[in-house]
């Protein structure tokens, strides 16, 4: 790595959890002094080039599209920037995982995902997402729909023949709201995942704000009723005056 430059970013433009045979676009941060950018996959501590972009596109971030995702293409990726004949810079690494049934079928069964204490919580509360499976599982991964960052990974615990992992979201903020799924994986290939659990929607409701809205609505209704009452009184009085004359 050259000097004290910040490490360039690498990101998956969609989710880093890719369905079998799906595709993903990887973006490497443009480096002004680089004349080419290589996309490397890291397998067993060995770096292998799987893509290469020349410096044509000015300061545009080089992009790479990986099609027909499978277990061989899952793993850790890194952008390597060539800035001289023997001078390189490297990005951070990106983990891509593939989800779908493997041929051996050991990941065929989906895990289940549940939430404690409730799927609707207030900010500041503690929430636990519990991922479980009756089949052998080494690690569980938790991903949030639409999030480009890497999924959370936890080693599974064996509880009375059930494999499980507890993902703690504490304290909850509005950013935690969304749809979650969990996956099983085995240590033989940590980048290959089972099919996802059923989606779980976590609603982070700001009750203070909701109560304020409710109070505001109630006040508006009362005000409207008051206006209508005054109007009715006024109309009624006017009618009496007319009758008298």
């Amino acid at each position: 790595q050259e000097g004290d430059f910040p490490m360039p970013f690498i990101s998956a433009k969609s989710s880093p959890v890719i369905p079998l045979d799906g595709s993903v676009k990887i973006q490497c941060q443009a480096i002004r002094e680089a004349y080419l950018t290589q996309l490397m996959i890291i397998k067993n501590s060995t770096y292998r080039e799987i893509g290469r972009r020349l410096k044509f596109w000015n300061e545009t971030d080089p992009e790479f599209v990986i099609d027909h995702m499978d277990a061989n293409k899952a793993g850790r990726y890194q952008c390597q920037y060539r800035i001289g004949h023997y001078r390189f810079r490297y990005s951070d690494t990106l983990e891509l995982v593939v989800t779908g049934e493997e041929p051996a079928g050991r990941l065929r069964d989906r895990p289940s995902l549940s939430v404690r204490p409730s799927p609707s919580v207030a900010p500041g509360e503690n929430v636990t997402l519990l991922c479980q499976s009756g089949n052998r599982t080494d690690t569980f991964l938790l991903s949030k729909e639409g999030a480009a960052h890497r999924p959370l990974r936890l080693r599974s615990q064996d509880q009375d023949g059930w494999y499980q992992a507890e993902f703690s979201l504490s304290p909850v903020t509005s950013a935690h709201g969304g749809t979650y799924r969990c996956y099983r994986s085995l240590s033989t290939n940590p980048y290959l995942l089972s099919q996802p659990s059923e989606p779980l929607a976590l609603l982070v409701a700001d009750y203070t704000m909701q109560n304020l809205i409710r109070m505001g609505l109630a006040a508006s209704v009362l005000l409207l009723l008051g206006i209508l009452l005054c109007q009715a009184r006024h109309d009624h009085g006017g009618a009496r005056e007319a009758a008298r004359s």
Epitope: S23, G51, R52, F56, E63, F64
Partner: antibody
Framework: EVQLVESGGGLVKPGGSLKLSCAAS????????MSWVRQTPDKRLEWVAT????????YYPDNVKGRFTISRDNAKNNLYLQMSSLRSEDTAMYYC?????????????WGQGTTLTVSS | DVQITQSPSYLAASPGETITINCRAS??????LAWYQEKPGKTNMLLIY???TLQSGVPSRFSGSGSGTDFTLTISSLEPEDLAMYYC?????????FGGGTKLEIK
């Protein structure tokens, strides 16, 4: 299934103009760089033009620079090649080709081609 | 520009044989050479890129080797459907350039 279908070829007089089109289907068009490659009557292949996936940047070899313009419409999944000041040496079969998502200058899908004849 | 010289321009072989086609670059292109197959009535097919990487879906009887300036396409256990025109192309630097092609006939 990836498909590229070229159209617009024909007979043009030297100095004339013509616009070729390529209709793409079966893939996310806006993710890929697209190119035109031609095959001369003596069966040689020549790269003619490339356009970046976003449609911002274009590249040409010196022999067509200033005469040919590549463009794309990502909303319609179409690629175009506007050719002007045509010469007899531009006579060729013109292919639309998709660049792979991983390497510049590498063409993983090609169309069937459309023929341009430049002759008086 | 990088000039690519392809040889032979014509080749005839029998089914089951192994054949080789060569390409030489006018300057070093590292490993960045691709091979394409052109068959009558079909669209051009990318066989090999980066010198030796087999494109997905291509039969394993096709293989590529070489780096620097000299490269080879090998087709082992030749099959009748391998009758085609074969082209090499450098994808190291602009402008992308192709070899002159090799016409392979099956005896």
């Amino acid at each position: 299934e990836v498909q590229l279908v070229e159209s617009g070829g024909g007979l043009v007089k030297p100095g004339g103009s013509l616009k070729l089109s390529c209709a793409a289907s079966g893939f996310t068009f806006s993710n890929y760089g697209m190119s035109w490659v031609r095959q001369t009557p003596d069966k040689r292949l020549e790269w003619v033009a490339t356009m970046h996936s976003g449609g911002t940047y274009t590249y040409y070899p010196d022999n067509v620079k200033g005469r040919f313009t590549i463009s794309r419409d990502n909303a319609k999944n179409n690629l175009y090649l506007q050719m002007s000041s045509l010469r007899s040496e531009d006579t060729a079969m013109y292919y639309c080709a998709r660049e792979t998502g991983l390497y510049d200058g590498l063409f993983d899908f090609w169309g069937q081609g459309t023929t341009l004849t430049v002759s008086s | 520009d990088v000039q690519i010289t392809q040889s032979p321009s014509y080749l005839a072989a029998s089914p089951g044989e192994t054949i080789t086609i060569n390409c030489r670059a006018s300057k070093t292109i590292s490993k960045y050479l691709a091979w394409y197959q052109e068959k009558p009535g079909k669209t051009n097919m990318l066989l090999i890129y980066s010198g030796s990487t087999l494109q997905s879906g291509v039969p394993s009887r096709f293989s590529g080797s070489g780096s620097g300036t000299d490269f080879t396409l090998t087709i082992s256990s030749l099959e009748p459907e391998d009758l085609a025109m074969y082209y090499c192309q450098q994808h190291d630097e602009y402008p992308w350039t192709f070899g002159g092609g090799t016409k392979l006939e099956i005896k």
